[in-house]
Amino acid sequence: SGTTNTVAAYNLTWKSTNFKTILEWEPKPVNQVYTVQISTKSGDWKSKCFYTTDTECDLTDEIVKDVKQTYLARVFSYPAGNVESTGSAGEPLYENSPEFTPYLETNLGQPTIQSFEQVGTKVNVTVEDERTLVRRNNTFLSLRDVFGKDLIYTLYYWKSSSSGKKTAKTNTNEFLIDVDKGENYCFSVQAVIPSRTVNRKSTDSPVECMGQEKGEFREI
């Protein structure tokens, strides 16, 4: 059902990275506008992005209230300039999104190596703990705050002079690895959430190499 001149939204898709969460849909509107509603399974509907001509709506503010909840969104279509108009059933045309559970489904953003420090034959590599838009007590939480030990980082490292890679893991944001004295190494990290079955991994961080600005070298 629905008003003549309006078409229902379709291809409703959640795009979410480190909890920044946007609902996208089609089609580009012609003589119509959209309003989005979001709800938890047991909660009330909340309207967002009122009468917009966009085909996306940022729902981050809603989902960060409880990232472990499962959310459902719907997109209403209204004729442009006549938003009071409803369909033959007395309802505006709408389409439901797939369910979305941020904690299980948000993509892990590309991590960044914050620093590395060599002390003798040990190197300490630190991964930046990215801030999310999830809040607790008026403070933005980091990725580590939200995921705790569920979040693992894998370090890849190799001698600048060789292609043979080694790897190590941590459930903190720091690695302490053994290296050969007098050799320069390159590093890259990947975030992983082992308990997930999909969206488990991030893309690899940019490569950082010793002998460049990021690190610090101390011969002991």
Partner: antibody, heavy 117, light 107 residues
């Protein structure tokens, strides 16, 4: 259900090459590394290396660098291990396994490779 | 490389007995340790991950403890089907080495 099914036994001559396949099903192939290990009475279980289907990255145990090559076919969710210049001491049962980062939770049935003249 | 040393190499125990096997890492690996059971002619089977967590479908008579260098696997009451070789593996840093195994037999 999750399965890793390996190719059949191989009898090869010293100096030859062999390719073992590991066809996976029942899970998202790109989300889990595929590990390779081998087992022999003389050396127990030895880790060979792994390949990450998400980014194609390979990590090898030092002794296998240059000897082994790990590869993938995304269209069939299959991992491959090729071993070159085989010696008698490469006689072993070779296993692939799915890596969940904290452990290897599903294993192939094993492929027996015998190097004999 | 991190060496994993299991002891004792072989154990003989009676049905219903409590059995403990140990695994020692040559350097600290936090809780990056897994335990496997392997029966003759079969693939290894995951028992424990992250040092203390029981894998899906593993009977509650199995438990594990440890962190750092020192780890142990305990069978609270030995069953006939527990006859197997048990392996520990560190998954902290490559190469991801295995112990040499503990062979468990019924006395």
């Amino acid at each position: 259900q999750i399965q890793l099914v390996q190719s059949g036994p191989e009898l090869v001559k010293p100096g030859a090459s062999v390719q073992v396949s590991c066809k996976t099903s029942g899970y998202s192939f790109t989300d889990y590394n595929v590990y390779w290990v081998r087992q022999s009475p003389a050396k127990g279980i030895e880790w060979i290396g792994y390949i990450d289907p998400y980014n194609g990255l390979t990590i090898y145990e030092q002794n296998f660098r240059g000897k082994g090559t790990l590869s993938l076919d995304h269209s069939t969710s299959t991992a491959y291990m090729e071993l070159n210049s085989l010696r008698y001491e490469d006689t072993a049962v070779y296993f692939c396994a799915r890596d969940v980062t904290t452990a290897l939770d599903f294993w192939g049935q094993g492929t027996s490779v015998t190097v004999s003249s | 490389d991190i060496q994993m040393t299991q002891s004792p190499a072989s154990i003989s125990a009676s049905i219903g007995e409590r059995v403990t096997i140990t695994c020692l890492a040559s350097q600290t690996i936090d809780t990056w340790l897994a335990w496997f059971l392997q029966k003759p002619g079969r693939s290894p089977n995951l028992l424990i991950y992250a040092a203390t967590n029981l894998a899906d479908g593993v009977p509650y008579r199995f438990s594990a403890s440890g962190s750092g260098n020192d780890f142990s696997l305990t069978i609270s009451s030995l069953n006939p089907e527990d006859v197997a070789t048990y392996y520990c593996q560190q998954v902290y840093s490559s190469p991801f080495t295995f112990g040499q195994g503990n062979k468990l037999e019924i006395r």
